[in-house]
């Protein structure tokens, strides 16, 4: 299920890098998320749980990348112009049933100002 | 207009097998997840089996093995596949529909908002 | 797995009183999952509530649901003659991914 562009803030600039924000509700306790760039898988990341409610992370794609209880952020550094392009985050929620796909995304444009050093 | 419409119930010996159908009509049936609910003669509602938009199935411990649910997003149809049938899934059984949508930090699930008018199945010998 | 116990069984009331139904579950349900049903005999159930306190489309305003965790309610503020019939809450996105309870028969005194 594709739910289009994502209604909220996408990517954050800083220091010639780019924070991207793939934010997925709370009450998911257990998904894969993955980062595409156009139809390429950059990052995945998978939370799952198991007995006595232990938590495991793991990447099959890995990138540098930061959990919280609603969202996943990754990080791309040293940005050029050929990062150009639209970035998607596929969710992937597994707990709670029923298992669901949304994609939600941006296009991430690329302006000399964010190309070094700069924090915005 | 929104409809659900069940068919294929009847009359079955005990361990015997029925498919049921459910065509929809008047909505984007591949967005919904789908669902079988029963109905004994003076009794409540039991959840039957569940499938979601992607495919995955779901059942409850009294059908698990037994029953089988499909869909054909094509033909806009759900369907029951009822194997090793006893006296006590004699009931009326309905389709249904519910939506959950998940946006951002947004988890939305909104109930089962479209039913059949159900179809008979008795199991006797 | 959650059980839904409503209560009470039957509930005897007259046209323009306030019902009050309770479902109560053996386990807590995210509030995001819980729904009521109405069933009037001979007729397939009816969507009233979604998410605990969200009104289904073309339900009255005198319909209302509430709760979190293992309790959750509905109430009728002024029943009509029409709202006689079984009510069923209902949860979902658990284990067993779906479940009902009982049912409370509404009648009228």
């Known amino acids: 299920e594709i739910n289009g562009s994502a209604n909220y803030e996408m990517f954050i600039f800083h220091n010639g890098g780019v924070q991207i924000l793939c934010k997925y509700p709370d009450i998911v306790q257990q998904f894969k998320m993955q980062l595409l760039k156009g139809g390429q898988i950059l990052c995945d990341l998978t939370k799952t749980k198991g007995s006595g409610n232990t938590v495991s992370i793991k990447s099959l794609k890995f990138c540098h990348s930061q959990l919280s209880n609603n969202s996943v952020s990754f990080f791309l550094y040293n940005l050029d112009h050929s990062h150009a392009n639209y970035y998607f985050c596929n969710l992937s929620i597994f707990d709670p049933p029923p298992f669901k796909v949304t994609l939600t995304g941006g296009y991430l444009h690329i302006y000399e100002s964010q190309l070094c050093c700069q924090l915005k | 207009e929104v409809q659900l419409v069940e068919s294929g119930g009847g009359l079955v010996q005990p361990g015997g097998s029925l498919r049921l159908s459910c065509a929809a009509s008047?909505?984007?049936?591949?967005?919904?997840?789908m669902h079988w609910v029963r109905q004994a003669t003076g009794k409540g509602l039991e959840w039957v089996s569940t499938?979601?938009?992607?495919?995955?199935?779901y059942y409850p411990g009294s059908v698990k093995g037994r029953f089988t649910i499909s869909r054909e997003n094509a033909k806009n149809s759900l369907y029951l596949q009822m194997n090793s049938l006893r006296a006590g899934d004699t009931a009326i059984y309905y389709c249904?529909?519910?939506?959950?949508?998940?946006?951002?930090?947004?988890?939305?699930?909104?109930?089962?908002?479209?039913w059949g008018q159900g179809t008979t199945v008795t199991v006797s010998s | 797995e959650i059980v839904l116990t409503q209560s009470p069984g039957t509930l005897s009331l007259s046209p323009g009183e306030r019902a009050t139904l309770s479902c109560r579950a053996s386990?807590?349900?995210?509030?995001?999952?819980l729904a009521w049903y109405q069933q009037k005999p001979g007729q397939a159930p009816r969507l009233l509530i979604y998410?605990?306190?969200g009104r289904a489309t073309g339900i009255p305003a005198r319909f209302s649901g509430s709760g979190s965790g293992t309790d959750f309610t509905l109430t009728i503020s002024r029943l009509e003659p029409e709202d006689f019939a079984v009510y069923y809450c209902?949860?979902?996105?658990?284990?067993?991914?779906?479940?009902f309870g009982q049912g409370t028969k509404l009648e009228i005194k």
């Open positions: 998410g605990a306190s």
């Open positions: 008047g909505f984007t049936f591949s967005t919904y997840e």
């Open positions: 499938i979601g938009t992607a495919g995955d199935t």
């Open positions: 209902q949860q979902y996105g658990s284990s067993p991914l779906c479940s």
């Open positions: 249904a529909r519910s939506s959950t949508v998940v946006s951002g930090y947004r988890y939305d699930y909104y109930g089962m908002d479209v």
């Open positions: 386990q807590s349900v995210s509030s995001i999952f």
